[in-house]
């Protein structure tokens, strides 16, 4: 029989929107044919108000940190590490996760991942669909309607349920993220919401929901009173840097 | 208009060939994940395939893998479904239907005869 | 797959009289995101499905008032408050939480 995509599962992944970008949809655990899902983070934190975070891998740092020595390249060199902030494009680099979100290790340099851009093809005057609430509206099939003045289309930004392309379509603190098989706008995510942090950067499995990102100045981290559990019930939430 | 429009139904032997279209309008596409639902004669609805809204993720009903393919052209606003092997059993209208937002076309009829 | 189970798969109503149709789900369709993806349309002979009730209790635009959804979980309900002779068709529920999306065996409303 059909390997069932669990919709309703707490444990299906949640995977954020790429940088400037796509998004998510539901599932039971299933057998789909490979996908590329995206890599999300946070903003990139500045220098001024970062404060180190100590780590022992990278899992416990956030989607754009890695888990390092302060004065060596590797993680797991002898010393202290905590989290550093991720190696933009072009930068060099010793494994995948030292790279920023939407890129990848390559011959020691961060490389853009193929499925980092929007695809072609997308629609440039887009229009946003609420979700939500205008399955009754009067115009049309209750579907979406066009505000238009002098024959020019103006968009309004797409409140939490509407369907997207990107995270620029919707709404502040709104994120494009998948949902089932379409994306819609969902919340970025606020200090001490459960946030999806990947153990390896382009090896994920189909992720049918995906959460936004982490706010501004917040990153995904391991929860403290988690570090002892077993590695796969660990809780990562967003945290202050 | 918001609407899905199905061609590409006919009658077609067992073992041939046949690629349905869905015309989509009025609304963001590429947005959207799509599927395609049958109805056999006298029957209930029967769940297809689906695509993603970038066309990466397809998933399948046991009763078309391998033979069914559901693809998408967002620049065309286009869905389709290319079905191979085709079998007496694969005969119904066949629907495209728009997830979330529920939304269904009018249907397209595959007869599979000899 | 979710198994969709519809009671009673036959209904005749006098015009004006309520009709209530049930439809329970294998599991709940309640997901996550605080939705339930439960649906309900009516199919007419030759036609597509017409789609009434959306997430268990919305109706679409255009659909009468006399309709209306209620339920959560895995017990739902469709209620006609007053039966019209258009109404006649067969009922189905629907759940697309999961793949594949399954439907009830259907619920014919006749006349009497």
């Known amino acids: 029989t059909l390997n069932s995509v669990l919709i309703n599962s707490n444990a299906i992944k949640n995977l954020p929107p790429p940088l400037g970008g796509a998004g998510g949809q539901p599932g039971s655990a299933v057998s789909v044919a490979p996908g590329v899902l995206y890599e999300g983070g946070n903003k990139y934190q500045t220098l001024d108000n970062y404060q180190p975070y100590p780590c022992a891998e990278d899992e416990e740092c956030g989607s754009d940190e890695y888990c390092s020595s302060p004065s060596r390249g590797a993680a797991g060199v002898g010393g202290v590490q905590i989290c550093l902030a991720c190696r933009k494009r072009r930068k060099r680099c010793m494994r995948h996760a030292m790279c920023c979100p939407g890129n990848y290790c390559k011959n020691g340099i961060c490389m853009p991942s193929d499925h980092s851009h929007f695809p072609r093809g997308e629609i440039e005057e887009s229009i946003i669909e609420n979700l939500g609430n205008d399955h009754n509206a009067a115009a049309g099939d209750g579907y979406p309607r066009r505000t238009t003045l002098t024959s020019k289309i103006y968009h309004t930004k797409g409140q939490e349920g509407s369907v997207c392309l990107r995270s620029s379509d919707c709404a502040a603190g709104l994120c494009c993220a998948r949902h089932f098989w379409s994306k819609i706008c969902k919340p970025v995510l606020k200090e001490g919401q459960v946030c999806t942090k990947h153990k390896r950067k382009g090896s994920h499995g189909l992720e049918i929901f995906q959460r936004c990102y982490c706010g501004e100045g917040l990153a995904c981290r391991i929860q403290k009173d988690h570090h002892q559990a077993s590695n796969s019930s660990r809780l990562h939430t967003c945290q202050r840097h | 208009q918001v609407q899905l429009v199905e061609s590409g139904g006919g009658v077609v032997q067992p073992g041939r060939s046949l690629r349905l279209s869905c015309a989509a309008s009025g609304f963001t596409f590429s947005g959207y994940g799509m599927h395609w639902v049958r109805q056999a004669p006298g029957k209930g609805l029967e769940w297809v395939a689906v695509i993603s809204y970038d066309g990466n993720d397809k998933y399948y009903a046991d009763s078309v893998k391998g033979r069914f393919t559901i693809s998408r052209d967002n620049a065309k606003n286009t869905l389709y479904l290319q079905m191979n092997s085709l079998r007496a059993e694969d005969t119904a209208v066949y629907y495209c239907a728009r997830e979330l937002r529920v939304l269904w076309g009018q249907g397209t009829l595959v007869t599979v005869s000899s | 797959d979710i198994v969709m189970t519809q009671t009673p798969l036959s209904l005749s109503v006098t015009p004006g009289q309520p009709a209530s149709i049930s439809c329970k789900s294998g599991?709940?369709?309640?997901?996550?995101?605080?939705?339930?993806?439960l649906y309900w349309y009516l199919q007419k002979p030759g036609q597509p499905p017409q789609f009434l009730i959306y997430?268990?209790?919305n109706r679409f635009s255009r659909v009468p008032d006399r309709f209306s959804g209620s339920g959560s979980g895995t017990d739902f309900t469709l209620k006609i408050s007053r039966v019209e002779a258009e109404d006649v068709g067969i009922y189905y529920c629907?759940?697309?939480?999961?793949?594949?999306?399954?439907f009830g065996q259907g619920t014919q409303v006749e006349i009497k």
């Open positions: 629907m759940q697309s939480i999961q793949l594949p999306w399954t």
């Open positions: 997430e268990v209790s």
């Open positions: 599991q709940s369709l309640l997901h996550n995101d605080g939705k339930t993806y």
